[in-house]
Amino acid sequence: SIPWNLERIIPAWHQTEEDRSPDGSSQVEVYLLDTSIQGAHREIEGRVTITDFNSVPEEDGTRFHRQASKCDSHGTHLAGVVSGRDAGVAKGTSLHSLRVLNCQGKGTVSGTLIGLEFIRKSQLIQPSGPLVVLLPLAGGYSRILNAACRHLARTGVVLVAAAGNFRDDACLYSPASAPEVITVGATNAQDQPVTLGTLGTNFGRCVDLFAPGKDIIGASSDCSTCFMSQSGTSQAAAHVAGIVARMLSREPTLTLAELRQRLIHFSTKDVINMAWFPEDQQVLTPNLVATLPPSTHETGGQLLCRTVWSAHSGPTRTATATARCAPEEELLSCSSFSRSGRRRGDWIEAIGGQQVCKALNAFGGEGVYAVARCCLVPRANCSIHNTPAARAGLETHVHCHQKDHVLTGCSFHWEVEDLSVRRQPALRSRRQPGQCVGHQAASVYASCCHAPGLECKIKEHGISGPSEQVTVACEAGWTLTGCNVLPGASLTLGAYSVDNLCVARVHDTARADRTSGEATVAAAICCRSRPSAKASWVQHHHHHH
Amino acid sequence: QDEDGDYEELMLALPSQEDGLADEAAHVATATFRRCSKEAWRLPGTYIVVLMEETQRLQIEQTAHRLQTRAARRGYVIKVLHIFYDLFPGFLVKMSSDLLGLALKLPHVEYIEEDSFVFAQ
């Protein structure tokens, strides 16, 4: 009889007696920026502090009738989903409510900013345990709202936001588009994207993961023991805020980067039917449904990575795309992808002391994406080795020459625009382990890292027959850090990582032109962290069909 | 995720000689004006003036006061609704859109964003 949504996100081994407070004694506090709430509801009484914060616009319409139960509906439900005794994710968590949405569920960017500042002031006046801020609201893209979220996140606060219910790219909305926020889309009991009337959950590269958001039973403000079902990305975000609160109550020192990586790593993969999303967004949207991760004590030492897509570069000839990792993460590799296949490659460069992944459009191209592989590598020392393009007819190669440094990724960038001139680059470990090799007119970049116990190997998979994509996966215990395409005769669209799978995409119009000897190869660099071992390079594996 | 989305950014580097103030004439607006791409969600008349990150507390207040003074000279009354100190330097102001050009030329201003609606999801 446990509600479907709790069963979905809380694995059986985490299900405690119905009313048990979160494990551990750390006082995690969740701040909810929403409508007013009914603090006396039996589901949340004694767990909620209704702050005196109130910054809302006037309700529309001269005949608007303020009915307390309607004014409190949205916020009460979400408070229940986060910390409710029976239908809540983090049953013992204390919650503070700030009213930034009026009785019609409308607020302003300025009111939300003042609310975020109120939280910052509270933090300064009385420092407490870990703070989680739930933002179950969305407006159009706002530079200042995103900036405020960034500033608050840098003080150690974890912000969780609704992706939005507009069946649209979440990057067009704020705070969903803020990189420092954990942005959550909504799925239903069948793990499918939520449809809401003619609209539905937002999607795209600004969504970190999905969580239950359809027919979620929770506290209703109709009465102190009333419950109702509500749907939306607000409910999905509330689930993730609850999960984060539980994670922090067990391990209060987890950082935002660790929380995000663990949420991604332990989520349920590949259950969402991606056909629901627009075709151009499918590759950018994570196929992840949140579940409560085990503690790091149970799963320590894993190398955790995630894929970060840039915004689309746009079609201009010199258009570039930039993908960034979070400050705490290491950029272990950089690749690029273009739907037309017209791209001039990718490289890593330092901007303002941070390494970023760049991709360059080619003449006649419709634009490119830069694809960064961002990882948590404790005590890592990483660097980029670059060899400029060699003279005509010669190949360029670069390897990790520092002692104990291992190759985690390769990038290739062509100086010339003429696609016919170049034989595209290759990653070749047969000649020398841990070496990136490019063909003529390509600059080659090797990402090299030293970290205690870090070891890496190349795994290749080639297909000679017609295929739109070639994939290769890292085996259990290994984490994909780099992904490249080594082309046959056909034009490649690029390569990117999906969880532990390296996907090399091929231009489908060229499928018939390929001869059997010209296999397109997906080359993955797979790494793992062995706490006691020294950094090492493992001889690679490859096979062709 | 950090690039500007479907978002309007307008450069309002308007001539400043009408003011006849040396310090103002010397300061050419490099700040930008931004507003929500969805017209129905905009709240014209309320603006968030965002200052450069290193702006000191006193300078925030001085900038807000300077805007009030200069607006008054032009016969406009503006209302500073809130000053932001703790998350970012800036202030929230209720004023006519006629004053945007003036506000963008104030020292320390990085950009001005028109207020807009957010909605429960």
Partner: antibody
């Protein structure tokens, strides 16, 4: 597992008082309200009142306000109901029941049969 | 006080039959209604909460529906062990009130 233990029976004289107990185990006693329900032989269920064990807050059915007093002892995880000035009308089975916000009265005691007789 | 009215004090049915018990609230109680089963000599047992949700371990032949003032409890295929009195209860406000009960008799 959750249990609510009640004594089986109490025999009391008219005009006297009786204090019924309900010992809770298998869950955090202070997390959920405790309710008391009366059932006369061959009759339906009648709600008497409820108490919040964490703070002692009570709500009564107006009909029982001068008849019943609800208390708790957190240290022993026990809820009590004192019935005063007993008459034959008070002869009934009295149940304690834990109420969860979502799941209503999900666990009931076995009931204490109170007989008022001289 | 909110009055909960179960129109039938008794209902007679056969094994395998479908039976529905109705309950009417004197005012809107949203979905804050629970249904209980009480077998002879036993304590009441929770079957349905929030008008339509089946409690843990309750067979799926038992269902609940309704909101506002009209509620229905249904047994899709009556079994011999379903002989009992069934009560509706509103949890919308205090005092909590129960319906008078419907005794299900097996022919």
């Amino acid at each position: 597992q959750v249990q609510l233990q009640q004594p089986g029976a109490e025999l009391v004289k008219p005009g006297a008082s009786v204090k019924l107990s309900c010992k809770a185990s298998g869950y955090t006693f202070t997390s959920y309200w405790m309710h008391w329900v009366k059932q006369r032989p061959g009759q339906g269920l009648e709600w008497i009142g409820e108490i919040n064990p964490s703070n002692g807050r009570t709500n009564y059915n107006e009909k029982f306000k001068s008849k019943a007093t609800l208390t708790v002892d957190k240290s022993s995880s026990t809820a009590y109901m004192q019935l005063s000035s007993l008459t034959s009308e008070d002869s009934a089975v009295y149940y304690c029941a834990r109420e969860r916000p979502l799941y209503a009265m999900d666990y009931w005691g076995q009931g204490t049969s109170v007989t008022v007789s001289s | 006080d909110i009055v909960m009215t179960q129109s039938h004090k008794f209902m007679s049915t056969s094994v395998g039959d479908r039976v529905s018990i109705t309950c009417k609230a004197s005012q809107d109680v949203s979905t804050a209604v629970a249904w209980y089963q009480q077998k002879p000599g036993q304590s009441p047992k929770l079957l349905i909460y929030s008008a339509s949700y089946r409690y843990t371990g309750v067979p799926d032949r038992f269902t609940g529906s309704g909101s506002g003032t009209d509620f229905t409890f249904t047994i899709s295929s009556v079994q011999a062990e379903d002989l009992a009195v069934y009560y509706c209860q509103q949890r919308y406000s205090t005092p909590r009130t129960f319906g008078g009960g419907t005794k299900l008799e097996i022919k």
